[in-house]
């Protein structure tokens, strides 16, 4: 099956202090390689979450990525702050035999818009 990375929401709004879920699904787990979430693009992009076991404060996976045939790579960001605003991308990599993993596909991005916490 052809690989497609889908981020169904163009944007989400969240009040500061709340949590939000950023959805991402894949149509195939092949080729073998990790899925990572970034905020921003190009040189200035920031790694937000990697489904490879590291710990990321305030960011957790929504479903069990270790389960066989799991295609859901959505994440939850807790205690959102205004600094979390930006566009988030779910990116699929192909594992290289020795060289670094190759970025092969990305979702269309989901903008996180942070609203002031209601007083």
């Amino acid at each position: 099956k052809e690989l497609k990375v889908t981020q169904p929401e163009k944007s989400v709004s969240v009040a500061a202090g709340d949590s939000t879920v950023l959805n991402c699904t894949l149509t195939s787990l092949l080729p073998v390689g990790p899925i990572k979430w970034y905020r921003g693009v190009g040189q200035s992009r920031l790694l937000i979450y990697s489904f490879t076991g590291e710990h990321f404060p305030r960011v957790t996976n929504v479903s069990d990525a270790t389960k066989r045939n799991n295609m859901d790579f959505s994440i939850r960001i807790s205690n959102v702050t205004p600094e979390d605003a930006g566009t988030y991308y779910c990116v699929k990599f192909q594992k290289g035999p020795s060289e670094p993993d190759t970025e092969i596909q990305s979702g269309g991005g989901t903008e996180v818009y942070v609203l002031a916490k209601p007083s």
């Epitope: 709004s13 693009v41 190009g42 596909q105 990305s106 269309g108 991005g109 903008e111 818009y113 609203l115």
Partner: antibody, heavy 118, light 108 residues
Framework: VQLVESGGGVVRPGESLRLSCAAS????????MNWVRQAPGEGLEWVSL????????YYADSVKGRFTISRDNSKNTLYLQMNSLRAEDTAVYYC????????????WGLGTLVTVSS | ETVLTQSPGTLTLSPGERATLTCRAS??????LAWYQEKPGQAPRLLIY???SRATGIPDRFSGSGSGTVFTLTISSLQSEDFAVYYC??????????FGGGTKVEIK
């Protein structure tokens, strides 16, 4: 789908103008809407975006702090309040309806001309 | 911000000829790219989205290709109504949404 812009005209630098875009033929509140402009002899420039609910708003740096986008879903109308106008704001302003999945534009109005001149 | 550069600025061709327009992105936008046609006094019209998918009602003489940083809009056989200005737009890196500077296709 029909988008009809109005409110353009000739103003002096520093003055204000309010553009409107009357929408019909689709469920207005379900779509994010944008303003895009084109200066004489120039290309297209994105100006501002507002989500269907009106909760999410973005502006181009060139208009931030001077322009305000809004919408009235009960009237199926999009607005652009333009304050502190400058000569470089002179352009045809288009109202554009976004695709429901991605940020490209399925439908456009004919535009309304704004001229800022002393 | 992703910068889009269109070339050539002007393309002078005869009806029936093939037109090839190029749009280059300063960084990868994958296939998140659209093409529009603009004629004087008319609303801009969406031609292509997703780099290669034709919008509703667009004739099959229009085709799009490319991914990453280089994209092409091809008009296989120019008709009189195709002489216009064409713009590419990326919707991956945002905000802001950015357009190319345009390519004018004019009659020889």
């Amino acid at each position: 789908v029909q988008l009809v812009e109005s409110g353009g005209g000739v103003v002096r630098p520093g003055e204000s103008l309010r553009l409107s875009c009357a929408a019909s033929g689709f469920t207005f509140s379900s779509y994010d809407m944008n303003w895009v402009r084109q200066a004489p002899g120039e290309g297209l420039e994105w100006v501002s975006l507002i989500s269907g609910s009106g909760e999410i708003i973005y502006y181009a740096d060139s208009v931030k702090g001077r322009f305000t986008i809004s919408r009235d879903n009960s009237k199926n109308t999009l607005y652009l309040q333009m304050n502190s106008l400058r000569a470089e704001d002179t352009a045809v302003y288009y109202c554009a309806k976004e695709n429901n999945r991605y940020r490209f534009f399925d439908d456009w109005g004919l535009g309304t001309l704004v001229t800022v001149s002393s | 911000e992703t910068v889009l550069t269109q070339s050539p600025g002007t393309l002078t061709l005869s009806p029936g000829e093939r037109a090839t327009l190029t749009c280059r992105a300063s960084q990868s936008v994958y296939t998140y790219l659209a093409w529009y046609q603009e004629k004087p006094g008319q609303a801009p019209r969406l031609l292509i989205y997703g780099a290669s998918s034709r919008a509703t009602g667009i004739p099959d003489r229009f085709s799009g290709s490319g991914s990453g940083t280089v994209f092409t809009l091809t008009i296989s056989s120019l008709q009189s109504e195709d002489f216009a200005v064409y713009y590419c737009q990326q919707y991956y890196d945002r905000p802001p949404l950015t357009f190319g500077g345009g390519t004018k296709v004019e009659i020889k």
